[in-house]
């Protein structure tokens, strides 16, 4: 006869491990007992369980409540056992010793491999600001056994670097994603992808990029200067900019206070029916936590009675 077992049994942390040991004997042969022991190199054998043809299953005190026979029906030549709720410390070498009649004793070894799936974590880097050089966008760490694979999935251009720390029974892998921040990256997903044999599918953690910036400011509304004449209603100036975080707007008049009747509504400056009093230099001040910008325009309200129109100057300043 001969023993049938597996070289390696692989199980995920917390699952039950079936340790196979089947005696394929000739007709008339009987199995008296099957003794299971853990036999890691450098350590003495530690008894696990005894399957006895007469006495039944004995579980050694160290494994009490954790070793069972597979559910019926059972073949009397099958010495397999179930190790319940495998933990990392169970990883190692196991031996089954089968005592048969009349053929004698047989033994076989197997290795139990306990996969510890990672629980990845993603940590964003420091605040990203347009104009910075190469900056850490995020780091992703995953610890498991064996070492997990950590990669990145994104449309954003950047560079990655990885490092690994080996522990006694596992390994931690950290991958960093660096980029040169630009406003086009704002709102783009950066996804950490963790692969591991103990996972049914890759684990993904997505971080949305936020890049602080503030665009140049400009003012719209003076494109047709002939519309700015005395008596015109509904005249307005609109300040144009964009930023992250979204900017706030403030209007002032460089050569004095805002005329009465002029309404400030965020990025828009609304005028009452135009008079020559509304002529002047208006400044739009745009700011967010990252920066501030100014844009100024000169408004010259035309008198229709005069033949020649006045020039309108647009000046932008930062």
């Amino acid at each position: 006869g001969e023993l049938e077992t597996s070289d390696v049994v692989t199980v995920v942390l917390g699952q039950d491990a079936k340790l196979p040991c089947f005696y394929r004997g000739d007709s008339g042969e009987q199995v008296g007992q099957v003794a299971w022991a853990r036999v890691d190199a450098g350590e003495g054998a530690q008894e696990l369980a005894l399957l006895h043809s007469k006495y039944g299953l004995h579980v050694s005190p160290a494994y009490e409540g954790r070793v069972e026979q597979p559910p019926p029906p059972r073949n009397p030549l099958d010495g397999s056992v179930l190790l319940r709720n495998a933990v990392q410390a169970d990883e190692g070498e196991y031996e089954c010793r089968v005592s048969t009649f009349p053929a004698g004793s047989f033994q076989a070894r197997l290795r139990l491999r306990v996969l510890v799936p990672p629980l990845p974590s993603l940590n964003p880097g420091p605040a990203l600001e347009e104009g910075q050089g190469l900056t850490l966008a995020a780091s992703c760490t995953a610890e498991g056994s064996p070492a997990p694979s950590v990669t990145w999935d994104t449309e954003v251009k950047g560079t990655t670097s990885s490092r690994s720390f080996k522990h006694s029974r596992s390994a931690a892998v950290t991958s960093e994603f660096h980029l040169v921040p630009s406003r086009s990256m704002n709102g783009q997903p950066l996804t950490c992808v963790v692969s591991h044999p103990g996972l049914l599918q890759d684990q993904r953690i997505t971080h949305i990029l936020h890049v602080s910036f503030l665009a140049e400011a400009s003012v719209r509304g003076l494109e047709d200067q002939n519309l700015w004449h005395i008596g015109r209603e509904g005249a307005m100036l609109k300040c144009l900019s964009e930023g992250q975080p979204p900017p706030s707007y403030n209007w002032t008049r460089l050569d004095g206070p805002l005329p009465s009747g002029v309404r400030v509504d965020g990025d828009t400056l609304g005028f009452p029916p135009l008079t020559t009093e509304h002529s002047g230099i208006y400044v739009c001040h745009v700011s967010n936590e990252f920066s501030s910008r100014d844009s100024q325009v000169t408004v010259d309200v035309l008198d229709p009675q005069e033949d020649s129109g006045k020039q309108v100057d647009l000046v932008s300043a930062s």
């Epitope: 008296g32 007992q33 003794a35 008894e47 005894l50 006895h52 007469k54 006495y55 039944g56 299953l57 004995h58 050694s60 005190p61 010793r97 005592s99 004793s105």
Partner: antibody
Framework: EVQLVESGGGLVQPGGSLRLSCAAS????????MSWVRQAPGKGLEWVSG????????SYADSVKGRFTISRDNSKNTLYLQMNSLRAEDTAVYYC???????????????????WGQGTLVTVSS | DIQMTQSPSSLSASVGDRVTITCRAS??????LAWYQQKPGKAPKLLIY???SLQSGVPSRFSGSGSGTDFTLTISSLQPEDFATYYC?????????FGQGTKVEIK
Amino acid sequence: EVQLVESGGGLVQPGGSLRLSCAASGYSFDTYDMSWVRQAPGKGLEWVSGIKQYKGYTSYADSVKGRFTISRDNSKNTLYLQMNSLRAEDTAVYYCAREYSDVVDYVSVRTPLDYWGQGTLVTVSS
Amino acid sequence: DIQMTQSPSSLSASVGDRVTITCRASQGISSYLAWYQQKPGKAPKLLIYAASSLQSGVPSRFSGSGSGTDFTLTISSLQPEDFATYYCQQHYTTPPTFGQGTKVEIK
């Protein structure tokens, strides 16, 4: 025919020592596990100590641990029980017994006691 | 340690009676259980091992059953030489432990 004959019992004062012997014959002594079991007067049976043939593993009841030592000399087919620091509660008939040999090379379990000696009386009294 | 509880502690019966003695373990012991007979002034004698296997030379009127925690010794037809004290013993763990004994007396 399997025979187990104990000797060495007697009267001893508390704190004293005795060494019990068990001479085995009629079987291959070195292939069997052995045990000592005692029975106080009018009381039930209490397992005291055992020794495995496999690597000579020994084990003891908590009540005698640290005071009693079991050993065997396979060349003389003899089992021993060295008893030190004896107490009044150790007074009993001490039996040596052979363990049934149907568990092979597995130390975590003992087996039934299929042959017993006639016993030797140990009396601890001042 | 595993506690073994026998019942009854004593019983009176007549020759020819069917006698049943029970033994309960404080935890599961599979079939790691033996039954012994002891007569006054004599060493115990193994009757049953592995809960239900009859030891060589023991009359077939003795039988054992059970597994796990509950076990039974049955004497199908009590004979004069069967009047004795009977002990159960677990050998699942060290130390092996005995029940307190059941004394079978003549009615």
